[in-house]
Every structure is written in C-alpha cells, then in structure tokens.
Interface confidence: low
Amino acid sequence: MNGRVDYLVTEEEINLTRGPSGLGFNIVGGTDQQYVSNDSGIYVSRIKENGAAALDGRLQEGDKILSVNGQDLKNLLHQDAVDLFRNAGYAVSLRVQHRLQVQNGPIGHRGEGDPSGIPIFMVLVPVFALTMVAAWAFMRYRQQL
C-alpha cells in the first residue's frame, strides 16, 4: 500500500454567468504550451477580482478545467481553448478539478500513535544489523568451542 495520503482531488460542476468582463479568469495550458509536465490540460492561472468567477467563489487558481458546457478540453491548442471559453455563451457550465495538498504533510503514519511517525526502515535496519552481529558472535563462539 502507498503510505502517502497527501493530496485530494475533487471534481465539481460550476455554473457561471458571464459578467461585464467575461467569466473573470485567465487560463494557461494546451497542447502547445503545457503548464504541467506531461499534461496538456487547461488550468486556471488567475482569478480576476470582482469577476464572475471570483464572485461565485468556487473556482480557484490552479484548478484544472476538464470541460466547458460538456465539451472536453483534452488535446486542445491554447488558442482553441481560449476561443471555446469566449464562445461559450452567457451561462457557462464548467467541470473543474481541484487538487488540495496537505501543507507540508509528512509521510503518513498508522493509527493514533505519535504524529511524527517512525519510518519502518529506521526500525528494521538496526534490528537486522543487531541480528547479524549476534549471529556472527554466535558462530565465532561455536568455533572456539
């Protein structure tokens, strides 16, 4: 089992009504300008103050936009994605992925023990070394007999 539980991905549908200054956010990404390595997805780079997205409050910088009005944003050039948002109409439905990080979270630990948690190898290595030393001493002692 992977011992890390340090981030959480949520997806939700966000319905925005276009305001005087548009949807109120900027995007980065696309097949021609990857924002995340090995990911050509479209990400929110900036939420404009008092814009439609900011007033709604759910969309956040760093969110990945998966679809606009049901249209998938996979494998789009950046400008094509921009055009899609511009032509999306007055009421816009966004499928958005939020990634929440545990801030400076350590490697997970088991149960209700000490929150610092002791990595298993820190226990196993000394035990193994002690076992080897004991075995060596025993063999040598036997030979002397």
Epitope: N2, G3, V5, V9, T10, E11, E12, H109, G111
Partner: nanobody, 120 residues
Framework: EVQLVESGGGLVQAGGSLRLSCAAS????????MGWYRQAPGKQRELVTA???????NYADSVKGRFTISRDNAENTMYLQMNSLKPEDTAVYYC???????????????RGQGTQVTVS
C-alpha cells in the same frame, strides 16, 4: 449513489473541542480513503487530514497535534476530533471519500454538504 453526511459542527470558544462525524452510505467504505477538508470564506480549500483503509493518516501542519482522524469501518463512519481550537480553524468542514491509497478522487456527489465550525 454514495452519500456523505457530516454533523457535529457548531460554535465553540477558542481552546474548546468539537467532534465531527461523517456517515457514509454505500458498501465500499471499507476500501476507501477518507478525508476532511475545509474552506473559510475567501480562502483556498485546505485538506486537513486523510486516512486510508489501513489506518495510515496524514495531517496538515496547521492542525497536527490538535486534530485526530479516525474511522469505524463497521459503522461506515469517520470522525474528526478537534481539540485546542483556534479562531483560524473557523470554516465549513467537508468529508470526502475516494478509492485510492495515494489520493482521494472525489466526484461532486461523493462529498458531503459540509458542517460549519465557528471558533470565537
């Protein structure tokens, strides 16, 4: 459809304690990762803590030593014991569930409606 229902929020004085509960319907609770995250008005969402089916836990630095996550697989319930509460802990707390031990992928209907915690 999986449903998550949080309870236990409320108004508490700084230094006080609260215990949040998250009841999950559905039969896949046993193999799920469960987590709590929170959002205060005008602030970014923050993942507070998560726990795997095997009991491995993780905490944000801001709550470490004060909050304890636990789960009762038999009862399909997860808990968040919050001690030494501070005004900055004020937020809506959501529970969420997923099916991976490395992260939680949560569809919108796999997240609760939240419970308000206010620390004065």
């Amino acid at each position: 459809e999986v449903q998550l229902v949080e309870s236990g929020g409320g108004l508490v004085q700084a230094g006080g304690s609260l215990r949040l509960s998250c009841a999950a319907s559905g039969s896949i609770f046993r193999i799920d990762v469960m987590g709590w995250y929170r959002q205060a008005p005008g602030k970014q969402r923050e993942l507070v803590t998560a726990i795997t089916s095997g009991g491995i836990t993780n905490y944000a630095d801001s709550v470490k030593g004060r909050f304890t996550i636990s789960r009762d697989n038999a009862e399909n319930t997860m808990y968040l014991q919050m001690n030494s509460l501070k005004p900055e802990d004020t937020a809506v707390y959501y529970c969420a569930k997923g099916i991976s031990d490395s992260y939680l992928r949560v569809e919108s209907n796999y997240r609760g409606q939240g419970t308000q915690v206010t620390v004065s």
